[in-house]
């Protein structure tokens, strides 16, 4: 019995098509993705094939404008028309707390939303309950499959998922779950979740009666033969794990924001074994028409997005200097803006111990692409952040040993003066830098906020130590020659959507005055 | 719980018309094949044939001219037909699942007048 | 039709002993292949699937591995229930089995 599986994940809000770095579209003919393109993919392998399943494996949530605006409504709007068959939850699915959860995705949704490892307790528990399922059994032709979901444990660090959820070890939460679905005498199951490829691949080795992983969270791309974009793959897809018990697992993921249509065909024997598996990921690209009907659609929810970008989201009384003839040589109150905007969109308090999981950000300065002039009545509008911040990434979670931060805040100095973006602004860091030193050895302080204190204050890093910072997603895949950061993260979570973090800072500041303060000297 | 079980007679004259059948249970005939096996005394496994999940049949080109396999969906039942039995046909016949992950316990078929 | 031959045809081993069969298709079965291990009664039971996939409830000293048209089953330690005779089973195509080896206490 032969069933395919079609697969997203880490969408992020990307509900119209893109350019092939998953920015926005500038030339149609170029552009990929997007729920209409995808819809015709999903019909055209429904048509052809009888035991079909479409899957997301989480983070629809955050990304663009279309979440900033719509809040979740879109991804249960258009993930029905779509019909997919199951959801699991990522981490960002809880960018707006468990409410923005609840109202506008839960309630709304015709398909089943999964995770066996978040429990609600408390008054939660009972508002939510039925709402998502650790596991839902599907009808597939004349068999059934059972889907269990999990969530990364991370969450209560990525997100807001409250105090009332709880964050279980997806393996020890998954057993039970798929113990019960074989007394139910469902034999070919999947496990279909958001905790990262790693994960994914234990999960195949650990859990007794899963066959086929489907994941998201590390936006891991998998390909088999020659890739036919510019990602590229971390292995072959499917990856197979050999189980403890000595069975071959594929485990699938493909890549992010809906440029790809993962493609997994399963061939189970009677007892619901696995006994071959193949296909790959499907590029979205023009050569595959977008739906006619979904794309009105889509076009009929755009209008309330263009009216979004031109209101006052909140006030500056001072100019917001996002000069590159600034924020390339010096402190620039531009990236203190954002960096403080970045940490206050981190601030977890999980921990007596800790005021916060994170305290210091940094930027390159080059990511900062225009000012923000305080004498058009001091109004700042989407339109206008998206004018600094036009590249469409995301402020992401690392974690880094001290030496690497050194290592970072050298580059960042290695050839000042010929005005490149490497040149870092900061937040919870005071760098001192000396460039009348040879270029590797320009940092002369570099001190760091604590986060295990009552009171903040600034200690010099420490070289074995590991940091929490937060970061733009370019720096952390080694860009503006960052490799060291690439090469020597200890860990790596997406972020939110970087204008999405700065709009909403100033939004619940109403008015912002940043200084240049002395973080850079 | 996946189980495979082949009824039919123990015994069968030559030229006579042998029909056993497989009765399924924990898996769906529309969803699987049946395949059909048998083993002489002492000697090694031989395919019969096959019956697919749409229904249709594949033989073993030896015993094309004699030998039908039918399915009835609802009762979970597959039939196997082999005319003009002789005493060579002797042997443990069994049916297995499509992939052999399941097979029935055999029943010994002797032709002898 | 795709030809299987198993060897050995026969072997004897003591208890703890590491026991290895092989089996070689006359064409690429591309991993389709079974291990079926039948005890004297004539039971058959299917050990390993997809050439090294290990069946439920099967010990974990049987394991199997291969590609192409060579393909290998291994009992790292043989058990007083091990001996019995095994097949090979290729599903590329219509099914054919290999010879069978009888595993014999020596």
């Known amino acids: 019995w032969e069933l395919t599986i079609l697969h997203t994940n880490d969408v992020h809000s990307r509900l119209e098509q893109t350019s092939e770095d998953s920015s926005k579209c500038v030339n149609a003919s170029r552009c990929m993705g997007g729920v209409a393109r995808l819809f015709t993919k999903v019909q055209q392998i429904r048509r052809a094939e009888p035991n079909v399943l479409l899957l997301d494996a989480g983070d629809q949530y955050q990304g663009t404008i279309w979440f900033t605006v719509y809040k979740g409504a879109e991804v249960a709007h258009f993930m029905n028309a779509l019909r997919y068959d199951a959801m699991a939850l990522g981490n960002h699915e809880f960018d707006n707390g468990v409410e923005g959860l609840i109202e506008p995705l839960l309630k709304e949704a015709k398909f089943p939303i999964l995770s066996a490892n978040i429990k609600a307790k408390g008054p939660l528990a009972s508002q939510i309950s039925g709402l998502y399922l650790p596991y839902k059994v599907l009808p597939v032709g004349d068999e059934v499959v059972g889907i269990v979901g999990y969530t990364s444990k991370e969450t209560p660090f990525l997100s807001n998922p409250g105090t009332n959820l709880v964050f279980e070890d997806e393996i020890t939460a998954l057993q039970p779950e798929v113990d019960k679905l074989k007394t139910l005498n469902v034999n070919k199951i999947i496990a279909l979740g958001h905790s990262g490829f790693e994960m994914d691949k234990l999960i195949a080795q650990k859990v007794r009666g899963v066959d086929v992983v489907v994941g998201g969270h590390s936006n891991t791309f998998l390909y088999t033969g020659n890739p036919p974009s510019k990602e590229v793959p971390a292995g072959k897809y499917p990856f197979i794990v050999t189980s403890d018990d000595g069975r071959k697992v594929p485990v699938v993921q493909a890549y992010a924001f809906g440029k790809y249509l993962g493609y997994l065909k399963i061939e189970f024997d009677e007892r619901g074994n696995v006994i071959s598996s193949h296909g790959n990921p499907i590029l979205l690209n023009s050569s595959i028409p977008e739906d006619p009907s979904i794309k009105a659609d889509i076009n009929k929810w755009r209008i309330k997005l263009d009216n979004y970008s031109t209101q006052e989201l909140g006030k500056t009384i001072v100019y917001l200097d996002g000069s590159s003839q600034s924020c390339r040589f010096r402190e620039c109150n531009m990236g203190n803006l954002i960096c403080d905007a970045m940490i206050n969109n981190n601030l977890r308090h999980t921990d007596e111990m800790f005021w916060n999981h994170v305290s210091m950000c940094i930027l390159n300065g080059g990511g900062i692409r225009s000012p923000i002039d305080e004498r058009n009545n001091g109004t700042i509008t989407w339109e206008n952040l998206a004018a600094v911040l036009p590249f469409g990434g995301t402020f992401d979670l690392v974690q880094l040993k001290g030496s690497t931060l050194k290592k970072a805040f050298e580059h960042s100095v290695h050839r000042y003066g010929q005005s490149t973006g490497e040149f870092l602004q900061v937040g919870g860091i005071h760098v001192v830098y000396d460039l009348s030193r040879k270029p590797g050895d320009r940092v002369v302080k570099l001190d760091v906020l604590c986060t295990k204190c009552r009171v903040p204050s600034y200690d010099p890093l420490k070289m074995d130590e590991v940091y929490k910072v937060i970061l733009p997603n370019f720096l952390a895949n080694g860009g503006d020659g960052f490799q060291m950061i690439k090469d020597e993260l200890l860990r790596h979570d997406s972020g939110d959507q970087d204008i999405n973090v700065v709009s909403t800072y100033i939004s619940k500041m109403k008015v912002i005055y940043p200084a240049v303060e002395g973080r850079i000297k | 719980e996946v189980t495979l079980k082949e009824s039919g007679p123990v015994l069968v004259k030559p030229t006579e018309t042998l029909t056993l059948t497989c009765t399924v249970s924990g898996f769906s005939l529309s969803s699987y094949g049946i395949q059909w096996v048998r083993q002489p005394p002492g000697k090694l496994l031989e395919w019969l044939g096959v019956i697919w999940s749409g229904g249709s049949a594949d033989y073993n080109a030896a015993f094309i001219s004699r030998l039908t396999i039918s399915k009835d969906t609802s009762k979970s039942q597959v039939v196997l037909t082999m005319t003009n039995m002789d005493p060579v046909d002797t042997a443990t016949y069994y049916c297995?699942?499509?992939?052999?992950?399941?097979w029935g316990q055999g029943t010994l078929v002797t032709v002898s007048s | 039709d795709i030809q299987m031959t198993q060897s050995p045809s026969s072997l004897s081993a003591s208890v703890g002993d590491r026991v290895t069969i092989t089996c070689r298709a006359s064409q690429d079965i591309g991993d389709r292949l079974n291990w079926l291990q039948q005890k004297p009664g004539g039971a058959i039971k299917r050990l390993i699937y997809?050439?090294?996939s290990l069946d439920s409830g099967v010990p974990s000293r049987f394991s199997g591995s291969g590609s192409g048209t060579e393909y290998t089953l291994t009992i790292s330690s043989l058990q007083p229930e091990d001996f019995a005779t095994y097949y090979c089973l290729q599903y590329a195509g219509s099914w054919t089995f290999g010879g069978g080896t009888k595993v014999e206490i020596k």
């Open positions: 297995a699942g499509q992939y052999g992950s399941v």
């Open positions: 997809a050439t090294s």
